[in-house]
């Protein structure tokens, strides 16, 4: 058993049929010595008396808010949560496996630049009685500070018969140099509590590997005289690291109709303009990627050909 | 500790082309190592990230773009002094700081070159003959060093009398390639910045 936060404790249980469970001793936070009784949750049934209560925690029925009283007055609470371990593996029931970029990916993180700010998100089908707490650091043995905000519900989607909820959090490394060469990864730890179930999820990454620039901005078309070609120009996104001559991007320019199966014109360039062939009912799209370290491409920025 | 704006004329910076070749060569070599050593811990997640130039050179700090010198987090540099002459410099416009940057890059290349050559000598003794260093990568390191053209003491190639542990050597190769790729990215960024300034 360990303390998650004040008056909240996590009991780690090997989860299998007829498991013996864990013996837990609760102590009432009071100077009083006698006349103390214990109850669980809203029940008025007295579980025991005395300053300490010894319980055998085997299942979710044994978890919950234990309260010690004296003469009708509440003295203190202890909330017990369960963390299940099945076949030596901690349970991952609360979050959905996003399977990208590999199986058992519960947390996904992205950074728009090298400033040390990044966003992580996760998915669940659970809608109520759910709380998250996020901690982060650079390295684990001698951790350097990363400050994370509160996790918030950022999107809801319908997937078949199920509703899916996306939560996200923003974090900022306390003293980040955009030009630094990372040797220690960022560690992100998410504590998830659903009713009386506790789970924790972790992700480890270098900022350079989770870079995904914002789409290029200010796409403009200029038809070329006596030609079916158009010159398309754009600018670096505002959120990208500066100076741009140091943090350079490369671009992919594509002309395509509405369907992905349609024919297309595609060209890669390090410049902020390109010449392509425009077709009726097609769109010109441009996306960006770090020129020197190939992490993710940005989303497309698009303008219609006409 | 940072790069001044007074730098060579655009498009006239001979090291840019070499640095692009360097990044390409080390990326290809790393990819080859990952594929060939698929049963060894050779991915970014599996290896320890070591920097053989740590406390010996200060490339990131010495080559910091002017715009980032206002960032306190970028300035906790280790002071190091280097020899200053080099053919990548348009000498009239060159300042001491830029020379410091380029000589730091030269020292990095020299240290990696020695490590790679020592390692290749060991790998050539491996009866499995599983992986060797790409001669193109070694040639590209050499070309960039020649373009930088700094005078510095020759670092003797390490020779070892004991029987090499090929497993450890291959893991060390992965560690070295990952670190060198990250340094090659920095070098490419620096050359691009200098070329544009």
């Amino acid at each position: 058993i360990w303390e998650l936060k004040k008056d909240v404790y996590v009991v780690e249980l090997d989860w299998y049929p007829d498991a013996p469970g864990e013996m837990v001793v609760l102590t009432c936070d009071t100077p009083e010595e006698d006349g103390i009784t214990w109850t669980l949750d809203q029940s008025s049934e007295v579980l025991g008396s005395g300053k300490t209560l010894t319980i055998q925690v085997k299942e979710f029925g044994d978890a919950g808010q234990y309260t010690c009283h004296k003469g009708g007055e509440v003295l203190s609470h202890s909330l017990l949560l369960l963390h299940k371990k099945e076949d030596g593996i901690w349970s991952t029931d609360i979050l959905k496996d996003q399977k990208e970029p590999k199986n058992k990916t519960f947390l996904r993180c992205e950074a728009k630049n090298y400033s040390g700010r990044f966003t992580c998100w996760w998915l669940t089908t659970i809608s109520t009685d759910l709380t998250f707490s996020v901690k982060s650091s650079r390295g684990s043995s001698d951790p350097q500070g990363v400050t994370c905000g509160a996790a918030t519900l950022s999107a809801e989607r319908v997937r078949g018969d199920n509703k899916e909820y996306e939560y996200s959090v923003e974090c900022q490394e306390d003293s980040a140099c955009p030009a630094a060469e990372e040797s220690l990864p960022i560690e992100v730890m998410v504590d998830a509590v659903h009713k009386l179930k506790y789970e924790n999820y972790t992700s480890s990454f270098f900022i350079r590997d989770i870079i995904k620039p914002d789409p290029p901005k200010n796409l403009q078309l200029k038809p070329l005289k006596n030609s079916r070609q158009v010159e398309v120009s754009w600018e670096y996104p505002d959120t990208w690291s500066t100076p741009h001559s140091y943090f350079s991007l490369t671009f992919c320019v594509q002309v395509q109709g509405k369907s992905k199966r349609e024919k297309k014109d595609r060209v890669f360039t390090d410049k902020t303009s390109a010449t392509v062939i425009c077709r009726k009912n097609a769109s010109i799209s441009v996306r960006a990627q770090d020129r020197y370290y190939s992490s993710s491409w940005s989303e497309w920025a698009s303008v219609p050909c006409s | 500790r940072n790069l001044p704006v007074a730098t060579p004329d655009p498009g006239m910076f001979p090291c840019l082309h070499h640095s692009q070749n360097l990044l390409r060569a080390v990326s290809n070599m790393l990819q080859k190592a990952r594929q060939t050593l698929e049963f060894y811990p050779c991915t970014s997640e599996e290896i320890d990230h070591e920097d053989i130039t740590k406390d010996k050179t200060s490339t990131v700090e010495a080559c910091l773009p002017l715009e980032l010198t206002k960032n306190e987090s970028c300035l906790n540099s280790r002071e190091t002094s280097f020899i200053t002459n080099g053919s990548c410099l348009a000498s009239r416009k060159t300042s001491f700081m830029m020379a410091l940057c380029l000589s730091s890059i030269y020292e990095d290349l020299k240290m990696y070159q020695v490590e790679f050559k020592t390692m290749n000598a060991k790998l050539l003794m491996d009866p499995k003959r599983q992986i060797f260093l790409d001669q193109n990568m070694l040639a590209v390191i050499d070309e960039l060093m020649q373009a930088l053209n700094f005078n510095s003491e020759t670092v003797p190639q390490k020779s070892s009398l004991e029987e090499p542990d090929f497993y450890k050597t291959k893991i060390k190769l992965c560690i070295l390639l990952h670190a060198f790729r990250i340094r090659a990215v920095t070098i490419d960024r620096v050359m691009s910045y200098l070329n544009a300034s």
């Epitope: 297309k264 014109d265 595609r266 060209v267 360039t269 010449t275 077709r279 | -």
Partner: antibody, heavy 118, light 107 residues
């Protein structure tokens, strides 16, 4: 299976014109760009131009501008390349080729040898 | 027009050995570079798109690298069926242009 079948070999006199055909099968004809590329004996490949069969848009290499005409007939899934004012240096194998991507080629015809000789 | 220059023009290789062919563009073309193989009396066949993207159905021994002006096609271990002429093509701008070809011959 996508296939491009070209018309047979031709022998032409200098100053005359030649029209080579290329019939496509497999896949929708207008879903692809069609290119014409030639190869003189023992030489490399030389791109001549492309056509978008969907709308008839064309683009020609400056070297052939004014001498080459590329057309397409959607009803028969056939593309044509006509080269006029032939000279001996036009002796080559002419390939039609196609792709959904405009700027490179994934399927080639078998080639048509055009010999220009007096 | 962008001029594509291949080297060497002829490359004698022992079967089973690796081979590397170089292609250089007269100006920077990013990764807009494609590789083809051609055997005598046959039409070309696509091997690599955009400098390094493999094409389905092409053996994994063929790989491409490069960007800007310098590109390389590598065949990791030459098989008897690989003895042919290899050509690069730029797609950075029209007109599309090809390298003159490199003939890989049996040593």
């Amino acid at each position: 299976q996508v296939q491009l079948v070209q018309s047979g070999a031709e022998v032409k006199k200098p100053g005359s014109s030649v029209k080579v055909s290329c019939k496509a099968s497999g896949g929708t004809f207008s879903d692809y760009y069609l290119h014409w590329v030639r190869q003189a004996p023992g030489q490399g490949l030389e791109w001549m131009g492309w056509i978008d069969p969907e709308n008839g848009d064309t683009e020609y290499a400056p070297k052939f501008q004014g001498r080459v005409t590329i057309t397409a007939d959607e009803s028969t899934s056939t593309a044509y390349m006509e080269l006029s004012s032939l000279r001996s240096e036009d002796t080559a194998v002419y390939y039609c080729a196609r792709n959904k991507e405009l700027r490179y080629i994934d399927v080639w015809g078998q080639g048509t040898l055009v010999t220009v000789s007096s | 027009d962008i001029v594509m220059t291949q080297s060497p023009l002829s490359l004698p290789v022992t079967p089973g050995e690796p081979a590397s062919i170089s292609c250089r563009a007269s100006q920077s073309i990013s990764i807009n570079l494609h590789w083809y193989q051609q055997k005598p009396g046959q039409a070309p066949r696509q091997l690599i798109a955009f400098a390094s993207q493999s094409i389905s159905g092409v053996p994994s021994r063929f790989s491409g690298s490069g960007s800007g002006t310098d590109f390389t096609l590598t065949i990791s271990s030459l098989q008897p069926e690989d003895f042919a002429t290899y050509m690069c093509q730029q797609s950075n701008s029209f007109p599309l242009t090809f390298g003159q070809g490199t003939k890989v011959e049996i040593k």
